[in-house]
């Protein structure tokens, strides 16, 4: 059997379990930042012809190892939910990053022949919906 | 996502078995008695972020584009090894009213890791 180790994620109370899985736990420093980026800046303008730019979100901020006060210790009826860090193992530092499974695609119009013909495509996993310390 | 094999220090998924008995939760968790939770570990050098196969690839590519050119605010943004795919797991447990509950708990198992 495995030696006693700290739970890899913050334990959470039953009320946290009941909320939508995609809702990240609030963290003081980890947040989502918006930035307007043009495909020209990226050098993708020969491929992506529309939109010319898009709102890019990224995750930014620090992730302390403290357990927020709204997260109680495991009690009967409080199943583990990785609402907070996913990797709080000895030596592992949580990171402010996009919550897995919540990235969204961007729908774009593309060309591969210099603008003679167009195609509608999706750029996968480009838009960050939620950030969390993971 | 890479599986950690001890030979590389690049971002990978490390096998980790959680025994509910070991962490003192077996008094209220009926089943399973434990499971492979796994976690992410390893380095994220700039050439790794945004590599194809990562579910964060396009997002990481954009950040990397600016980071490698030293542009603010991405210059100091650290790429780190994080779960990119998580899986739910069915659990049977007693709630605080001692009712027996079967529930699919989201995000219990780390399936894949990648560089943010």
């Amino acid at each position: 059997s495995t030696p006693l180790m700290s739970w890899p994620w913050s334990p959470s109370a039953l009320r946290l379990l009941q909320r939508p899985p995609e809702e990240p736990a609030a963290h003081a420093n980890c947040h989502r930042v918006a930035l307007n980026i043009s495909f020209q800046e990226l050098g993708w303008e020969r491929w992506i012809v529309y939109p010319p730019s898009f709102i890019f979100h990224y995750c930014h901020g620090g992730c302390g190892l403290h357990i927020p006060p709204n997260l109680s210790l495991p009690v009967p009826g409080a199943p583990p939910t990785p609402a907070q860090p996913y990797s709080l193992l000895p030596g592992a530092q949580p990171c402010c990053a996009a919550l897995p499974g919540t990235m969204r695609p961007l729908h774009v119009r593309t060309t591969s022949d210099g603008g003679y013909s167009f195609k509608y495509e999706t750029v996968p996993n480009l838009l960050t919906q939620h950030c969390a310390c993971i | 996502g890479l599986e950690c094999d001890g030979k590389v220090n690049i971002c990978c998924k490390k096998q980790f078995f959680v025994s509910f008995k070991d962490i003192g939760w077996n008094d209220w968790i009926i089943a399973p008695s434990g499971y492979h939770a796994n976690y992410c570990e390893g380095e994220c050098p700039s050439h790794i972020a945004g590599t194809s196969g990562s579910s964060l690839s396009f997002h990481s590519t954009v950040i990397n584009h600016y980071r490698m050119r030293g542009h603010s605010p991405f210059a100091n943004l650290k790429s780190c090894c994080v779960p990119t795919k998580l899986r739910p797991m069915s659990m049977l447990y007693y709630d605080d009213g001692q009712n027996i509950i079967k529930k699919d708990i989201q995000n219990m198992i780390v399936e894949e890791c990648g560089c943010s």
Epitope: - | A31, S33, G34, L92
Partner: antibody, heavy 118, light 107 residues
Framework: QVQLVQSGAEVKKPGASVKVSCKVS????????ISWVRQAPGKGLEWMGG????????IYAQKFQGRVTMTEDTSTDTAYMELSSLKSEDTAVYYC???????????WGLGTAVTVSS | DIQMTQSPSSVSASVGDRVTITCRAS??????LAWYQQKPGKAPKLLIY???KLETGVPSRFSGSGSGTDFTLTISSLQPEDFANYYC?????????FGGGTKVEIK
């Protein structure tokens, strides 16, 4: 391969108790639950309860609460089901089954016929 | 407890026929449903779990569908060895409950 071997048929008098055994092989005993399901002659299947050797928990259907006891012996990889205060309505075939997933019974024992008659 | 209602209670069919058995749950059980086959004097055998996943070793003529409250077990081309009783069972919540069974007999 995974096997569940049950004890032999029993004939009991009303008011008595019966203890049925289920010896497992082919997998790690503590990794899966054992459910007990009964079937009265010409009737359907009825879940009685389950034992979770890994965690030591037992859960029983309300109908059998107080009358059934499920135990385990991890040294012999054997699960037991004891039913007390037997009535003629308890005449049935009693099956043990492994739970592959929670409440899904993927491998079954051959059954133990229990007859309650005065 | 969740009630499981199977229909029909019996069906007469010939070898090669397509047979459909339905199962209705008294509340939403998503896809937490299993189907079992039981031959006379034998133990039940798991055919399908998670409403549509075929258990290892079960012939592909068996298929399951449905989610929520309405489920179906289909035998695409009935074989002689398929004449048996079939039971659905919900695995969504405690306690697990079985349908009353459907007897598939030779016409």
């Amino acid at each position: 391969q995974v096997q569940l071997v049950q004890s032999g048929a029993e004939v009991k008098k009303p008011g008595a108790s019966v203890k049925v055994s289920c010896k497992v092989s082919g997998y790690t005993f503590t990794s899966s639950a054992i459910s007990w399901v009964r079937q009265a002659p010409g009737k359907g299947l009825e879940w009685m309860g389950g034992i979770y050797p890994g965690s030591g928990h037992t859960i029983y259907a309300q109908k059998f609460q107080g009358r059934v006891t499920m135990t385990e012996d991890t040294s012999t990889d054997t699960a037991y089901m004891e039913l007390s205060s037997l009535k003629s309505e308890d005449t049935a075939v009693y099956y043990c089954a492994r739970e592959g997933d929670i409440f899904v019974m993927d491998v079954w024992g051959l059954g133990t016929a229990v007859t309650v008659s005065s | 407890d969740i009630q499981m209602t199977q229909s029909p209670s019996s069906v007469s069919a010939s070898v090669g026929d397509r047979v459909t058995i339905t199962c209705r749950a008294s509340m939403d059980i998503r896809n937490d449903l299993a189907w079992y086959q039981q031959k006379p004097g034998k133990a039940p055998k798991l055919l399908i779990y998670d409403a549509s996943k075929l258990e290892t070793g079960v012939p592909s003529r068996f298929s399951g569908s449905g989610s929520g409250t309405d489920f179906t077990l289909t035998i695409s081309s009935l074989q002689p060895e398929d004449f048996a009783n079939y039971y659905c069972q919900q695995a969504k919540s405690f306690p697990p409950t079985f349908g009353g069974g459907t007897k598939v007999e030779i016409k």
